[in-house]
Interface confidence: medium
């Protein structure tokens, strides 16, 4: 299953809208900065697009449960987040259309729940966070910049296990 | 592996500018802060300002504010220093310098650093 | 800004002497210390972040502690390749300002 043309510009358009949702500016939130420890190696050792597309799946589903939440609602802009939860629908979409055709059944099932099981941990973390910081707007503002990176890595890896196919 | 690779060595009269070059490789460009900071002969490290090419913000320290640019191209990987209105005391070796490693966040640790560029200002 | 001192500005010591170098931020930094070496003619490498993480491939014999103000490099059996210059630097808030260095020289 190749993802169509049109999932990586969405790729885009999501970073693009994540870039406009911002209200104030990361330097003057420095001192709220969080690692999160993104598990960038569940998308680097993936060593095929099927073992990848469940766990960037998992991904954007946890990117769009982070933002669909009330909490967040009054945090963002309403028009930029009904066009970010548009665009991960859409990928979504497509990502689970390859599920669909079997592209997300391999020999490891496994190392593959082990992947998606991190992310979820990482999201724990985030919104444990979240929670911690009470919702302030330097809170989300970290959290903002750390899933434009996340998800910036995330599509970069996936990106260049397709050049290797 | 990760590196950062910088331009040559400059010589440059006083009042004039000079552009540093600084090639990302290895790493997700775009995603991790790049940093410049300058070493004048003999002396200390002195932080001069820095970007997340993602966010499309650069942040410079405020002995520096309107002398200095920072600009990213993300096409070519590569980070820019511009510095303008230069005296005899920029004469130092600037490096750029980036937080990649896996417990690094930004800004939090400098553990990439280019060689360095050799900037002499003289008359 | 922030201002960061260290001391001693320089240090006298012999291989397999235990060192500590410290560093005084002017306000509070929580935990965003880092620690660099530097050697003549070459970049400096980062030893410790975070006041107290080791740097990926960086020898045990380094470690790092403090909080708020107060913070210490501690290099626990000299080598003959630990003679260098030492910097601590806040990556609390910009500008992120370096101590003036330690120069650890031979006895």
């Known amino acids: 299953c190749d993802l169509p043309q049109t999932h990586s510009l969405g790729s885009r358009r999501t970073l693009m809208l994540l870039a406009q949702m911002r209200r104030i500016s990361l330097f003057s939130c420095l001192k709220d900065r969080h690692d999160f420890g993104f598990p960038q190696e569940e998308f680097g050792n993936q060593f095929q697009k099927a073992e990848t597309i469940p766990v960037l799946h998992e991904m954007i589903q946890q990117i769009f449960n982070l933002f669909s939440t009330k909490d967040s609602s009054a945090a963002w802009d309403e028009t930029l987040l009904d066009k970010f939860y548009t665009e991960l629908y859409q990928q979504l979409n497509d990502l689970e259309a390859c599920v669909i055709q079997g592209v997300g059944v391999t020999e490891t099932p496994l190392m593959k729940e082990d992947s998606i099981l991190a992310v979820r941990k990482y999201f724990q973390r985030i919104t444990l966070y979240l929670k911690e910081k009470k919702y302030s707007p330097c809170a989300w503002e970290v959290v903002r910049a750390e899933i434009m990176r996340s998800f910036s890595l995330s599509t970069n890896l996936q990106e260049s296990l397709r050049s290797k196919e | 592996q990760v590196q950062l690779v910088q331009s040559g060595a400059e010589v440059k009269k006083p009042g004039s500018s000079v552009k540093v070059s600084c090639k990302a490789s290895?790493?997700?460009?775009?995603?991790?802060?790049i940093n410049w900071v300058r070493q004048a002969p003999g002396q200390g490290l002195e932080w001069l300002g820095g970007?997340?090419?993602?966010?499309?913000?650069?942040h410079y320290a405020q002995k520096f504010q309107g002398r200095v640019t920072i600009t990213a191209d993300e096409s070519t990987s590569t980070a820019y220093m511009e510095l303008s209105s230069l005296r005899s005391e920029d004469t130092a070796v600037y490096y750029c310098?980036?937080?990649?490693?896996?417990?690094?966040?930004?800004?939090?640790?400098?553990?990439?650093w280019g060689q360095g560029t050799l900037v002499t200002v003289s008359s | 800004d922030i201002q960061m001192t260290q001391s001693p500005s320089s240090l006298s010591a012999s291989v397999g002497d235990r060192v500590t170098i410290t560093c005084r931020a002017s306000q509070s930094i929580s935990s965003y210390l880092n620690w660099y070496q530097q050697k003549p003619g070459k970049a400096p490498k980062l030893l410790i972040y975070?006041?107290?993480s080791l740097q990926s491939g960086v020898p045990s014999r380094f470690s790092g502690s403090g909080s708020g103000t107060d913070f210490t490099l501690t290099i626990s059996s000299l080598l003959p390749e630990d003679f260098a210059t030492y910097y601590c630097?806040?990556?609390?808030?910009?500008?992120?300002?370096f101590g003036q260095g330690t120069k650890l020289e031979i006895k």
């Open positions: 290895g790493y997700t460009f775009t995603s991790y802060d």
């Open positions: 310098v980036s937080s990649v490693g896996a417990g690094a966040y930004y800004y939090q640790g400098l553990d990439v």
């Open positions: 975070a006041a107290s």
């Open positions: 970007t997340v090419p993602l966010f499309g913000i650069s």
């Open positions: 630097q806040q990556s609390y808030l910009p500008p992120y300002s």
